[in-house]
Structures are given as structure tokens and as C-alpha cells.
């Protein structure tokens, strides 16, 4: 067992040309943190496989803005070491990944504005207990400069953290068959320590707190015998008739390994692959932390720091489920109205609106009246966001500001004459038709076709038009 | 890094079709709103199209509605522009494009393809 | 629509010369605006986003400023490799609308 240390020495623009864009601003003023990932390995995994080696995120750093017309400096950091435990034995070969996030705090809308600025990956040789190793990588623009160490934790020692070391019982030497620890020469290799509870005549280990059963026991603990016959044959009981030719139950047989696991056998025993949440001998232990990196697709797992307590994953735009497993479309839900596109920038979603509508969601429909008086009388009407005046009589145009001649569309019907009046228009009647636009003919018998003329008005008379 | 390239153009007679691709490669394609621009001969930039990432959605300028029609196949990575009923006035360079709005999300490459030119002529 | 009205429509000027190009928004359009370079038979070149952010590349020289309906490029110190038209682009809404172009010509 023992910690992998990442220690971030500077983040920013890296040398040449093209220095890049600060990636806060006034306007959107964020803190930078970052994520290690691990794998075992010199692997040339995608960024998405699991972190087998473990995981860990920083805390978040100093909050920045940036300065107008400033170049994007070196941005300030988290404080701290970013540390990864590992339980089992340092590989010695391993992949990383170092992803450098920015979280926004601005207000935005849906969900976390978090987005991912840099990620940089690579493959290293490590011994465990050696010096701080020194780095430098670069993603796009920018670079990144870091240092890293894989250390032991007492009582392991060595360079894959296996050896075990405890104080010397007698003040001379060691006890027999184990050697002085280097260098820490005044304490002694101890033997291994296999699980708790494994059998001591029928289980061994190889690794601290493992329990490998010896051919014919199972369980756990090596405590369940495979077999109840003394048949020589390795895979078990004899028949009374045939010898040992009935096969007895192999180490898989009935699959040992729980939730789910594969079983496979080995030379001596058998051995459990398990799903994702589960680990231990039979996969019987369940419990998923960050360390274990659940969360896909650059997913930031928070909480989750010992297995009794829950991870959440914090999922990236376009990503969701309970891992980030699931790729999705923000803007499927159709957060924009009245036709807007909608345009997930990542940290937010912007709706672009179509002519006439305006608003975060495009939900306003322009008042396109407002601020625009009709002139000469007229009056404004709002309609799909264009305005239209209506005009008083004798004035036309976009804004009443025209003046019309109301006479220009032959309003008088039948060959009436149309005079120009100061509130509209005057139409003067043909024989045989009267109306305001000559529209109705007189009867030959002096009847008209109205009910009545209005008093004061003969038939043939001018009729104004109001 | 970004790239962007155009093809499909050529001359064609009054009234008739063409259609214009783009394909695009160095950056999540699906996850972008794409426009189409052009350039008459001489003049002005003019913008003709845009389709939503998941090409849902279309916006399409007045000059060109219900003759043009943008599509995008997310699986090939690639951007369309179907052109019909073209007329002389259509004549000019089509750049397809990343939409501004990702300007400060994308940083290598081209925003712009290299454009390739349309000739409506009889 | 939201009509872009950029001036000077072309403008004469010497190297080491500081330009200012303007962009009149008929209506507000909040930092939603896009400045590019084109030469001759070129592709437009992105110069700046946001209206103020210098797009990574782009010499310290070009600056861009303004926002709501008045907006300006800059050139502090104009070189022989910036002799060119400028265009702005609004992209707050549909329709996407672009200036009509200046071009800065050699003195």
C-alpha cells in the first residue's frame, strides 16, 4: 500500500506564438482545480477507461479575472497535493492523466459551469520511495508543469511497496530467513500478512491480506474442503465403480466469485474478476469510491471517499447518469422558444432568437411599438415582432408621416367623382347612384335601394365619407 | 485540430441544383451549430444557413427560404447545403462554419472552409 | 433584422498608422459581435470574438472594443501583412447580419 503525490507547479500559456485567451473573465470570473487519474501500466487506454490505480481531485484554487487586454498568465492555483492511495502494490509502470478544469461562477444555466480546459496524458517508469520526478506537458496552448512521487506507507517498504518492515525484536539481527530493510537498517522484513482468518494450513499469500487456498479447500478463508474423497485424482471424489474418473467440483465450479464476478481458475486456486463496485477475493465487498474513478466521459466524482459513503458524478455538457455514462443533448429538451436555437456553449446554453423575440429563451415577443409614436394621429400594432401603424385618414406610410391622397384608390364607385376633404374624402355621385361611395343605385320609381337616405340628404346628393 | 472542407460546387443553368458538403474533422462534430456564408464575386459576406448540432433546428436567410435546404449527417461528420431553383444572383463562394457563438470554446484549426464556388449561368 | 453599417467603407493608410474601423448595430446587440480579416481569394480570418477577445493567434495589435450598438477594431500600428478588408458579423440573432466591409488600402 502507499500514495502516489502529484504536486501542480504552474498552469498557463506555454512558449511561442499564439498565447490563448484567458479562460476567465469579467464577465465570467472562475477558479481553475484539477483531476489525476491513474492506471497501472503503460496502457493506451482512452481517457474514459477506468482509473484502475486510483483517482483523486484537487480543491478548488484562488478565484481569478482577468485583466482586459492582459495576456492569460500563469493562473493561480489549488493548494496542496493531489494524492492518490493505492492498496495494492505500486506497478512500478504506470499511465496518467492530468485534467485541468475551470469552474465558472457567473450565473448559469444548467447545471455545474464547469468545463474542461486542458487534459494531458503519459506514460512513466516509477520505483516507489524515489525522489520527487519533475515534468512538463503541454495540451494546445497550454502548458503544465508538475512533479510526482510514489511513496509507501509504513510498514511497506520497497520500490513496489510489498516488502513489509517492522521494528528489530532483538537489537543485533533479525529473526531467521529475514533480511534488514533498506535502507532502514534498524528495522527488519516481516513476513507477509495474509488476510485475517486465512487458514494457516490450508491458505498462503503472496500479497498482504490476500488468502490463496491450497488444492482441495475453498472459501475464503480456505477453511471449506473441496472434496470429501481421498481420491488422488486432483479433481475429486471417486466412484465405488469407476475409481476416480467422476469429475468433482473445480475451484469454480458453483462460481465463488459473488455479484456478479468471473471466476478462473489458477495452479493452485481460483480467482475472481469483479464487476465495477465490487473487489475482494469473491467480489463480496461492494462500496464504490472516486478512488475507483467511476465516472466516464471526464465525469468530476465528488464525495465518496470511503466506500460507506456515496460518490456523485458531475457530468460534463453533453453527458448524464448516474457515471456520465450517457451521452445527451441538453438542448433536446428545447429550452428556447418561439423557434430560437439553442446553443450549448458547454458552461451555459445561449438561445439564439429568431427576428422579433428576444430574452434568455427567446420568450419575448418585441415590443416594437414601444419608443416608435405613429405619427399624425396614428396608432401603432405589435404583430411577429414587426410594428404597423394605422394611420388617420388623409396620412399614410410606415409611420403615418406620408400624407395621403385619399382619393388615389378611385374609392367612388360607378363613376362618382372624388373630392380630397380635410377627415377624408367626398364622393360625388353619378345620376342614378348615391351612397358614400356610390355604391347603391337609384330606383327608376325614386326609391332607393336603402331602407332610407339620412334626413337632410337627397339621393344624388355628395355623400362624405367619414 | 479543426478543419473544414468543401466540396460540391460548380456551374450550373438558371433554375437548376447543386448541393454543397463539408466535411469536418478535429472536434465533436454533433456538438456544434454549422452555418453556411457566402461571398458574391466582389462583394460582401452574406450569411445563408444554420442548422443546430443535433439538426433539428434550420435558420435560413430571406434570399434563399424555401429554394435552400441545410442538413448535416452526424455520423459522416458532414454538413450539406441542397441548392434549388438557383438563380444568377446565387453565383459566388460557399464557406461552410463553425458558428461564432464557439469562438472562445475551440481554439486550433479553421473555423472556415476553403470555400468552393457556385456559378449560376446559362 | 439587426442591419450592420461598418465604416469607412475603404480608407487609405500608411504602415505604423493606428486604424479604427467602426460597426453601427441598428438595434442592440450586447457583445455579440465578430470582427475578420479577408485578403484577396482568401478565407475570412477570425480576428475577434466577443466583441473585445482577441482570437489566440492574432497579433496584440488588433483590438476590439464597444458594446450594445457601437463597436470598433483597431489596429494600433498598421503592417504591410494587414492591408486587407474587415468585416463584422452580429451573431445575437437570426438573421446573422455582416458590416458591409472596409477595406484599408497602402497609402
Known amino acids: 500500500a502507499g500514495v502516489f503525490e502529484l504536486q501542480i507547479h504552474s498552469f498557463g500559456p506555454g512558449p511561442g506564438p499564439g498565447a490563448p485567451r484567458s479562460p476567465c473573465s469579467a464577465r465570467l470570473p472562475c477558479r481553475l482545480f484539477f483531476r489525476v487519474c491513474l492506471k497501472p501500466g503503460l496502457s493506451e487506454e482512452a481517457a474514459e477507461s477506468p482509473c484502475a490505480l486510483g483517482a483523486a481531485l484537487s480543491a478548488r484554487g484562488p478565484v481569478y479575472t482577468e485583466q482586459p487586454g492582459a495576456p492569460a498568465p500563469d493562473l493561480p492555483l489549488p493548494d496542496g497535493l493531489l494524492q492518490v492511495p493505492f492498496r495494492d502494490a505500486w506497478p512500478g509502470t504506470f499511465s496518467f492523466i492530468i485534467e485541468t478544469w475551470r469552474e465558472e461562477l457567473g450565473d448559469q444555466i444548467g447545471g455545474p459551469a464547469w468545463s474542461l480546459l486542458a487534459r494531458v496524458a503519459g506514460r512513466r517508469r516509477l520505483a516507489a520511495g524515489g525522489p520527487w520526478a519533475r515534468d512538463i506537458q503541454r495540451a494546445g496552448a497550454w502548458e503544465l508543469r508538475f512533479s510526482y512521487r510514489a511513496r509507501c506507507e509504513p510498514p511497506a517498504v520497497g520500490t513496489a511497496c510489498t516488502r513489509l518492515c517492522r521494528p528489530r525484536s532483538a537489537p543485533s539481527r533479525c529473526g531467521p530467513g529475514l533480511r534488514p530493510c533498506a535502507p532502514l537498517e534498524d528495522e527488519c522484513e516481516a513476513p507477509l500478512v495474509c488476510r485475517a482468518g486465512c487458514s494457516p494450513e490450508h491458505g498462503f499469500c503472496e500479497q498482504p491480506g490476500e488468502c490463496r487456498c491450497l488444492e482441495g479447500w475453498t472459501g475464503p478463508l480456505c477453511t471449506v474442503p473441496v472434496s470429501t474423497s481421498s481420491c488422488l485424482s486432483p479433481r475429486g471424489p471417486s466412484s465405488a465403480t469407476t475409481g476416480c474418473l467422476v469429475p468433482g467440483p473445480g475451484p469454480c465450479d458453483g462460481n465463488p466469485c459473488a455479484n456478479g464476478g468471473s471466476c478462473s481458475e489458477t495452479p493452485r486456486s481460483f480467482e475472481c474478476t469483479c464487476p465495477r463496485g465490487f473487489y475482494g477475493l469473491r467480489c463480496e465487498v461492494s462500496g464504490v469510491t472516486c478512488a475507483d474513478g467511476p465516472c466516464f466521459n471526464g465525469g468530476l466524482c465528488v464525495g465518496g471517499a470511503d466506500p460507506d459513503s456515496a460518490y456523485i458524478c458531475h457530468c460534463p455538457p453533453g453527458f448524464q447518469g448516474s457515471n456520465c455514462e450517457k451521452r445527451v443533448d441538453r438542448c433536446s429538451l428545447q429550452p428556447c422558444r418561439n423557434g430560437g436555437l439553442c446553443l450549448d456553449l458547454g458552461h451555459a446554453l445561449r438561445c439564439r432568437c429568431r427576428a422579433g423575440f428576444a430574452g434568455p429563451r427567446c420568450e419575448h415577443d418585441l415590443d416594437d411599438c414601444a419608443g416608435r409614436a405613429c405619427a399624425n394621429g396614428g396608432t401603432c400594432v405589435e404583430g411577429g415582432g414587426a410594428h404597423r401603424c394605422s394611420c388617420a385618414l388623409g396620412f399614410g406610410g410606415r409611420d403615418c408621416r406620408e400624407r395621403a391622397d385619399p382619393c388615389a384608390a378611385r374609392p367612388c364607385a360607378h363613376g362618382g367623382r372624388c373630392y380630397a376633404h380635410f377627415s377624408g374624402l367626398v364622393c360625388a355621385c353619378a345620376p342614378g347612384y348615391m351612397g358614400a361611395r356610390c355604391e347603391f343605385p337609384v330606383h327608376p320609381d325614386g326609391a332607393s335601394a336603402l331602407p332610407a337616405a339620412p334626413p337632410g340628404l337627397r339621393p344624388g346628393d355628395p355623400q362624405r365619407y367619414l | 485540430e479543426v478543419q473544414l472542407l468543401e466540396s460540391g460546387g460548380g456551374l450550373v443553368q438558371p433554375g437548376g441544383s447543386l448541393r454543397l458538403s463539408c466535411a469536418a474533422s478535429?472536434?465533436?462534430?454533433?456538438?456544434?451549430?454549422m452555418n453556411w456564408v457566402r461571398q458574391a464575386p466582389g462583394k460582401g459576406l452574406e450569411w445563408v444557413s444554420t442548422?443546430?448540432?443535433?439538426?433539428?433546428?434550420?435558420y435560413y436567410a430571406d434570399s434563399v427560404k424555401g429554394r435552400f435546404t441545410i442538413s448535416r449527417d452526424n455520423s459522416k461528420n458532414t454538413l450539406y447545403l441542397q441548392m434549388n431553383s438557383l438563380r444568377a444572383e446565387d453565383t459566388a463562394v460557399f464557406y461552410c462554419?463553425?458558428?461564432?457563438?464557439?469562438?472562445?470554446?475551440?481554439?486550433?484549426?479553421?473555423?472556415w472552409g476553403q470555400g468552393t464556388l457556385v456559378t449560376v449561368s446559362s | 433584422d439587426i442591419q450592420m453599417t461598418q465604416s469607412p467603407s475603404a480608407m487609405s493608410a500608411s504602415v505604423g498608422d493606428r486604424v479604427t474601423i467602426t460597426c453601427r448595430a441598428s438595434?442592440?446587440?450586447?457583445?455579440?459581435l465578430a470582427w475578420f480579416q479577408q485578403k484577396p481569394g482568401k478565407v475570412p480570418k477570425r480576428l475577434i470574438y466577443?466583441?473585445?477577445s482577441l482570437q489566440s493567434g492574432v497579433p496584440s495589435r488588433f483590438s476590439g472594443s464597444g458594446s450594445g450598438t457601437e463597436f470598433t477594431l483597431t489596429i494600433s500600428s498598421l503592417q504591410p501583412e494587414d492591408f486587407a478588408t474587415y468585416f463584422c458579423?452580429?451573431?445575437?440573432?437570426?438573421?446573422?447580419?455582416f458590416g458591409g466591409g472596409t477595406k484599408v488600402e497602402i497609402k
Open positions: 442548422i443546430s448540432g443535433s439538426g433539428g433546428s434550420t
Open positions: 478535429g472536434f465533436t462534430f454533433s456538438s456544434y451549430a
Open positions: 466577443a466583441a473585445s
Open positions: 458579423l452580429q451573431h445575437d440573432s437570426f438573421p446573422l447580419t
Open positions: 438595434q442592440g446587440i450586447s457583445n455579440y
Open positions: 462554419a463553425i458558428d461564432p457563438e464557439y469562438y472562445d470554446i475551440l481554439t486550433g484549426g479553421d473555423y
